[in-house]
């Protein structure tokens, strides 16, 4: 079995409305080759949050703060959080395939909860 692991270190993150949420994801390898995408929710109805290769995601920026020798950082930050952003976010590794990429491995997910904006 190949040892690529998808690590989402935080089970949950709580952010005040209007602030930014950082969702952390690390992987132990680039192999197998293929893209990394972020989704909210699981299964057929999941929502694509970020795909670096294609699409327009104006509220999402990539954050690679701490470079470690033994893993690769694929974290994102979502700006201007609203209650509608609450949910569980998954960092997903795909394997390059023909004609379509194949889902290879998902992180355990990070639940984002949104607090009311401080008055």
């Amino acid at each position: 079995e190949d040892e690529l692991q998808v690590i989402q270190p935080e089970k949950s993150v709580s952010v005040a409305a209007g602030e930014s949420a950082t969702l952390r994801c690390a992987m132990t390898s680039l192999i197998p080759v293929g893209p990394i995408m972020w989704f909210r929710g699981a299964g057929a109805g999941r929502e694509l949050i970020y795909n670096q290769k294609e699409g327009h995601f104006p509220r999402v920026t990539t954050v690679s703060e701490l470079t470690k020798r033994n893993n690769l950082d694929f974290s994102i930050s979502i700006s201007n959080i609203t209650p509608a952003d609450a949910g569980t976010y998954y960092c997903v590794k795909f394997r390059k395939g023909s004609p379509d990429d194949v889902e290879f491995k998902s992180g355990a997910g990070t639940e984002l909860s949104v607090r009311a904006k401080p008055s």
């Epitope: 190949d2 390898s29 670096q52």
Partner: antibody, heavy 118, light 111 residues
């Protein structure tokens, strides 16, 4: 101490075959992506093949695809490159290299020389 | 394929001075804020040795007179101050996309 020791190089005629081996020690071989990189005076360094840590996935550039086959035996800490239908342009020093994250080449062997000539 | 143009091909620098080597990729090698460009040193008769990984990270055991910078398509390796044992050929390498490719090398000599 990390060690990668290549063997199996030599002189072969065009169209012939060779099997290169790389014996690894000093690190957890089964956790590493492994690759071969070759070097010629004319073309510099060229990536040749890569295999995932468990051996499931292999990758090759077009220049060797269909002719070279990379495999590994994690129980023996060994990497193998089967080279068929060799051409003069395959003449090079072949290095075995490890990649902890499948990104940069962390460690390199001393290399083994392959000469393809009639 | 991502083509890497490395310059200069050779460089003569006085001991104690700064040596600067450049690599330009034909397309971005960045992903999620990671820059997949790496630098190696090769001395005659030896294999390449990793110096800098992912654009700017010093490999363990490498002297801190070596540094790397850059992102997307433009990257730089700096040696400051240059010492006699730094005479070697330096290569950059991208692992941002297959096929992985290398620069043509820069031979660094003492002026």
């Amino acid at each position: 101490e990390v060690q990668l020791v290549e063997s199996g190089g030599g002189l072969v005629k065009p169209g012939g075959s060779l099997r290169l081996s790389c014996a690894a020690s000093g690190f957890t071989f089964s956790s590493y992506v492994m690759s071969w990189v070759r070097q010629t005076p004319g073309k510099g360094l060229e990536w040749v093949a890569t295999i995932s840590s468990g051996g499931t996935y292999t990758y090759y550039p077009d220049s060797v695809k269909g002719r070279f086959t990379l495999s590994r035996d994690n129980a023996k800490n060994s990497l193998y490159l089967q080279m068929n239908s060799l051409r003069a342009e395959d003449t090079a020093v072949y290095y075995c290299a490890s990649q902890l994250t499948g990104s940069e080449f962390d460690y390199w062997g001393q290399g083994t020389t392959v000469t393809v000539s009639s | 394929d991502i083509v890497i143009t490395q310059s200069p091909a050779s460089l003569a620098v006085s001991l104690g001075e700064r040596a600067t080597i450049s690599c330009r990729a034909s397309e971005s090698v960045d992903s999620y804020g990671n820059s997949f460009m790496h630098w190696y040193q090769q001395k005659p008769g030896q294999p390449p040795k990793l110096l800098i990984y992912r654009a700017s990270n010093l490999e363990s055991g490498v002297p801190d007179r070596f540094s790397g910078s850059g992102s997307r398509t433009d990257f730089t390796l700096t040696i400051n101050p240059l010492q006699a044992e730094d005479v070697a050929t330096y290569y950059c390498h991208q692992s941002g996309d297959l096929p992985w490719t290398f620069g043509g090398g820069t031979k660094v000599e003492i002026k």
